[in-house]
């Protein structure tokens, strides 16, 4: 807290400029008008103030706006943003994407601080939903943002926003999240043609049901093994050998290297050995010829 002292004669700041870097903390407090500071915030970033001096400037703004800063000030905070606490930020009403971008730019290269986390939460809540432009901005700065949202939060993401999602944004999404995102992606990309559709939907396929995988197998998509290995085991199990062969195309040979891993391992156990042999890959562990296969799940459903 800076003591209230009168401004020395001739030191009253007529504007925010470089001369202020020579002011002591108490002089800044006494000689810089808070309203002037608020209207000339854009100049602060160009002046090499010390951290102590920035503390004084923040204090002046806090006194002027005890209920929280207006967006006109927030947008030009620049490095002063790094001085804000989550409690300060909770008082703000940030509605402009330009303001959000400006503040995230200041924090670029830094980690996801509690301040930034609070800012993003305030912004998204204010918008009411995660629209495409917001998602575009957030994933550009923090590629893992989407995968940090709960399935419940993701359910309110409109399908149109999915266009902003890049494959790397889904790197750390778990199966529960992909279960929510996949139907949205399917809806978003539904008007694309076969090959273009597959390129876009590929990253989301960890949430795809069996019937969609069967449909894809009819479209010569040549799914790579990395994508196949991320599919839901329960979605892969009902696929026939012929369907998997069509789904993977030339990549089917890769099954051999993955035969001990899920979902390939579990899928092999469900196939007739005769059918597996038609692939000519030496896959072992299928159901021996002559054995009767009972679908117990169907039996339970009927009883």
């Amino acid at each position: 807290e800076v003591e209230k002292t009168a401004c020395p004669s001739g030191k009253k700041a007529p504007e925010i400029d470089e001369s202020l870097i020579f002011y002591k903390k108490w002089e800044l407090e006494a000689c810089v008008d808070a309203a002037l500071l608020a209207t000339q915030m854009d100049r602060v970033n160009a002046i090499p103030f010390t951290y102590e001096q920035l503390d004084v400037l923040k204090h002046k703004l806090d006194e002027l706006y005890p209920q929280g800063y207006p967006e006109s000030v927030i947008q030009h905070l620049g490095y002063l943003f790094l001085k804000m606490s989550p409690e300060d930020i909770r008082k703000w009403n940030v509605t402009s994407l330009e303001t959000l971008k400006a503040l995230l730019e200041v924090n670029k290269g830094h980690e996801m601080s509690p301040q930034v986390a609070t800012l993003i939460d305030r912004f998204v809540k204010g918008r009411g939903q995660l629209d495409k432009d917001t998602l575009d901005t957030l994933t550009a700065f923090y590629p893992g943002y989407l995968c940090s949202l709960s399935p419940e939060e993701l359910s309110s993401v409109p399908p149109s926003s999915i266009w902003a999602v890049r494959p790397q944004d889904l790197d750390t999404c778990d199966p529960r999240q992909l279960d929510v995102l996949y139907p949205k992606a399917r809806l978003a990309f539904q008007n694309m043609n076969g090959s273009e559709y597959f390129v876009k939907i590929q990253s989301f396929l960890g949430g795809a049901p069996t019937e969609d995988l069967k449909a894809l197998s009819q479209q010569n998509v040549s799914m790579d093994l990395a994508t196949f290995m991320k599919l839901r085991t329960d979605a892969v199990l009902p696929l026939t050998v012929a369907e998997v062969q069509k789904l993977l195309g030339p990549h089917v040979e890769g099954l051999k290297a993955e035969e001990r891993h899920r979902p390939v391992r579990d899928w092999i156990l469900r196939q007739r050995q005769d059918d597996l042999d038609t692939l000519g890959l030496g896959l072992q562990g299928g159901i021996p010829n002559g054995y009767l296969v009972l679908d117990l799940s169907m039996q339970e459903a009927l009883s």
Partner: nanobody
Amino acid sequence: QLQLVESGGGLVQAGGSLRLSCTASGSTSMSYGAKWFRRAPGKEREWVASVYRDGTTGYDDSVKGRFTISRDLAKNTVYLQMNSLRLEDTAVYYCTALNSWGQGTQVTVSS
């Protein structure tokens, strides 16, 4: 780049318990949640548990009821409490947050 450090792994008998920790460096906020994945010898990486931004949690069916994920925002740390450990839980456990990954901690369950 966010640094994540896992700890708490070790050798434990089947039926025993361990608590893994994942701590984020510097001023990073764990308020954006984190996940635990694991990779067993000769197997693909698989998801174990998540704590999401809003504080809700999710678990793979294989660990549901046995493992509990939690976070301490003041300590920038996410925990994985593992009870009733089984032989098949043997793996290297990795923590991830905001697309960053830790180096992993080895958990070995013996009979």
